[in-house]
């Protein structure tokens, strides 16, 4: 049969509120060298126990009896400290444990989760969380909005999660936790009501250097909108603005619009250029979220100036004309050049030269037409740019370089088709 337990004093019980400090104590009487006393909580050796051991000899000889007292200090009682405590000693080849003592927690409810401050769009549903525990259980929750209870009694209304169908003004929320020991009140969360995200951002009109955009404002609760902010950023295929990407990759062009009207003219833009735009509206409580980025594009314009450095020389029934691209902005993709020539008493002849910058003309009437002038204009998909001033055809003088003659051909079909002017085809043999 087992030897008699050396324990003469067993741990007591401790029950208290969180943060309490207490001590468990056990005492044993042993013969010979005193053993180390270990503490168990729910069968598990406490490795980092705050314990002290005191040993008092009862006689002169080491082999006499000793009284050993071990004290375990629990500082700032927590739920994790609760359980059954025992002392444990290894004596020779035997193991002894004391009778158990119990540590319990009992006090006002303790919050595991409290409502947090947040922003919400006006009239938009959201949830708040609150969680509390004892012991003692049960713990019943009571939600308050602007200090007004949302239920008749604790435990009757929503508990861990409060669903708010929407707010039209900034409000405060808190929760009370009730148990047999009393009431604890959570922090107060401020829920700030911001305007809803604007909707239906769209283009009203487009011009090569400006876009007019409009949108529908979202609800903003009791707070009128003070202004809306529009951002535009150049889109680049490699830029990576996705539908909901939060930040543009470069500094956007930002404009503020007084509201109403919910419309804004964005000027000083590049023609024939893709942009992404978004809008947010602000009330006294703060700004709404941005709309998704909307891809838009300024249209092409016509070239702003005529071709440059036009020269025209004549040699008998042939005329050689060449020019350079306009220096003025093209406002789009250059599709080609139109050339017009006219004699003093002859009708004007219009030609589409395509993208070449020189042409050899076969003149009718064996070169007898007098006072011939040539005009050239550049064109984009949006139309013709201004015509150059008429350039007179100069007679070719020996010593001048003979021009390289090229056939006047129909240009390759452009990406956009336009109503063609009457083309004259002159074949040079």
């Amino acid at each position: 049969q087992a030897e008699e337990s050396p324990f003469v004093g067993n741990p007591g019980n401790i029950t208290g509120a969180r943060g309490l400090t207490g001590t468990l104590r056990c005492q044993l009487q042993v013969q010979g060298e005193p053993p180390e006393v270990h503490w168990l909580r729910d069968g598990q050796i406490l490795e980092l126990a705050d314990s002290t051991q005191t040993q008092v000899p009862l006689g002169e000889d080491e082999q006499d009896d000793w009284i050993v007292v071990s004290q375990l200090r629990i500082t700032s009682l927590q739920l994790s400290d609760t359980g059954q405590y025992q002392c444990l000693v290894f004596l020779g080849h035997q193991t002894f444990v004391s009778q158990p003592g119990y540590v319990g927690l009992e006090g006002l409810p303790y919050f595991l989760e409290e409502p947090e401050d947040r922003t919400v769009a006006a009239n938009t549903p959201f949830n708040l969380s609150c969680q509390a525990q004892g012991p003692p259980e049960p713990v019943d929750l009571l939600w308050l909005q602007d200090a007004v209870p949302l239920a008749t009694a604790p435990g009757h209304g929503p508990q861990r999660s409060l669903h708010v169908p929407g707010l039209n003004k900034t409000s405060s929320f808190s929760c009370e936790a009730h148990n047999a020991k009393g009431v604890t009140t959570s922090r107060t969360a401020t829920i700030t009501v911001l305007p809803q995200q604007p909707r239906n951002l769209h283009l009203v009109s487009r011009q090569p250097t400006e876009l007019e955009v409009a949108w529908t404002p979202g609800l903003s609760g009791i707070y009128p909108l003070t202004h809306c902010t529009l951002q535009a950023v150049l889109s680049d295929d490699g830029m990576g603005i996705q539908a909901g990407e939060p930040d543009p990759p470069e500094e956007p062009l930002t404009s503020q619009a007084s509201v109403p009207p919910h419309q804004l003219r964005l000027g000083s833009l590049h023609p024939h250029t893709p942009y992404h735009i978004r809008v947010a509206c602000t009330s006294s409580q703060g700004p709404s979220s941005w709309t998704h980025w909307l891809p838009v594009e300024t249209p092409e314009g016509v070239p702003l100036g005529p071709p440059e450095n036009i020269s025209a020389t004549r040699n008998g029934s042939q005329a050689f004309v060449h020019w350079q691209e306009p220096r003025a902005p093209l406002q789009g993709t250059l599709l080609g050049y139109r050339l017009a020539y006219q004699g003093q008493d002859t009708p004007e002849v219009l030609m589409d030269i395509g993208l070449r910058q020189e042409v050899t003309l076969e003149l009718q009437g064996d070169g007898s037409v007098s006072n011939l002038t040539v005009c050239v204009a550049a064109y984009t998909a949006a139309g013709d740019g201004p015509w150059s001033l008429p350039v007179p055809l100069e007679a070719w003088r020996p010593g001048q370089a003979q021009p390289v003659h090229q056939l006047v051909k129909e240009p390759s079909t452009p990406a956009f088709s336009w109503p063609h002017h009457h083309h004259h085809h002159h074949h040079h043999h």
């Epitope: 270990h38 168990l40 490795e47 059954q84």
Partner: antibody, heavy 116, light 106 residues
Framework: QVQLVQSGAEVKKPGASVKVSCKAS????????INWVKQAPGQGLEWIGW????????KYNEKFKGRVTLTVDTSISTAYMELSRLRSDDTAVYYC?????????WGQGTLVTVSS | EIVLTQSPDFQSVTPKEKVTITCSAS?????MYWYQQKPDQSPKSLIY???NLASGVPSRFSGSGSGTDYTLTINSLEAEDAATYYC?????????FGQGTKLEIK
């Protein structure tokens, strides 16, 4: 001396329950925790849970919670483990073991075979 | 849960040799325990509180270590030491065991 003697081998069908006993002697039964440990064929050791005979308090490994029930009868110094809704992967040797912060004494083991 | 990894999984040794088995924990622990299990027998406590010999265990067995790394040493191996050895922790719940090291005598 401390001894833990377990009940004999069992063969059960899937979905059935099994109850294994562990009789303790040689020490004050109500002072020490009784643990149960599983060892599947050719496998290692897996802790199932403990019971404190003095109070009947129990603690279970999450993996076994809901299917295992630990009980004691202090009048005959015997601990029991009941495993319900048996599956083929419950086939194993089940050991009871006394604990003093570790498993200082073990029963001889009970083989439970689950087979249809 | 804390995972214990033993090394090696298997070792074949000759009598009188010194054997070292290591056990590595996935988190720091305070104490390690070691058990011996012979074929068709139940496990038997060998070392407790990292370095204390359990009742009846020969002095050729010893344990050491701290933190995450622990060692079981058998000085001058004997034929009767052929068994599987398991390390175990109970620093946090649930208590867990290593996968075992099988020791074979040549």
């Amino acid at each position: 001396q401390v001894q833990l003697v377990q009940s004999g081998a069992e063969v059960k069908k899937p979905g059935a329950s099994v109850k294994v006993s562990c009789k303790a002697s040689g020490y004050p039964f109500t002072d020490f925790y009784i643990n149960w440990v599983k060892q599947a064929p050719g496998q290692g050791l897996e802790w199932i849970g403990w019971i404190y005979p003095g109070s009947g308090n129990t603690k279970y490994n999450e993996k076994f919670k809901g299917r295992v029930t630990l009980t004691v009868d202090t009048s005959i110094s015997t601990a029991y483990m009941e495993l319900s809704r048996l599956r083929s992967d419950d086939t194993a040797v089940y050991y009871c073991a006394r604990s003093t912060g570790f498993f200082d004494y073990w029963g001889q083991g009970t083989l439970v075979t689950v087979s249809s | 849960e804390i995972v214990l990894t033993q090394s090696p999984d298997f070792q074949s040794v000759t009598p009188k040799e010194k054997v070292t088995i290591t056990c590595s924990a996935s988190s720091s622990i305070g104490y390690m325990y070691w058990y011996q299990q012979k074929p068709d027998q139940s496990p038997k406590s060998l070392i407790y509180l990292t370095s204390n010999l359990a009742s009846g265990v020969p002095s050729r067995f010893s344990g050491s270590g701290s933190g995450t790394d622990y060692t079981l040493t058998i000085n001058s191996l004997e034929a009767e030491d052929a068994a599987t050895y398991y390390c175990q922790q109970w620093s946090s719940n649930p208590p867990t065991f290593g996968q075992g090291t099988k020791l074979e005598i040549k």
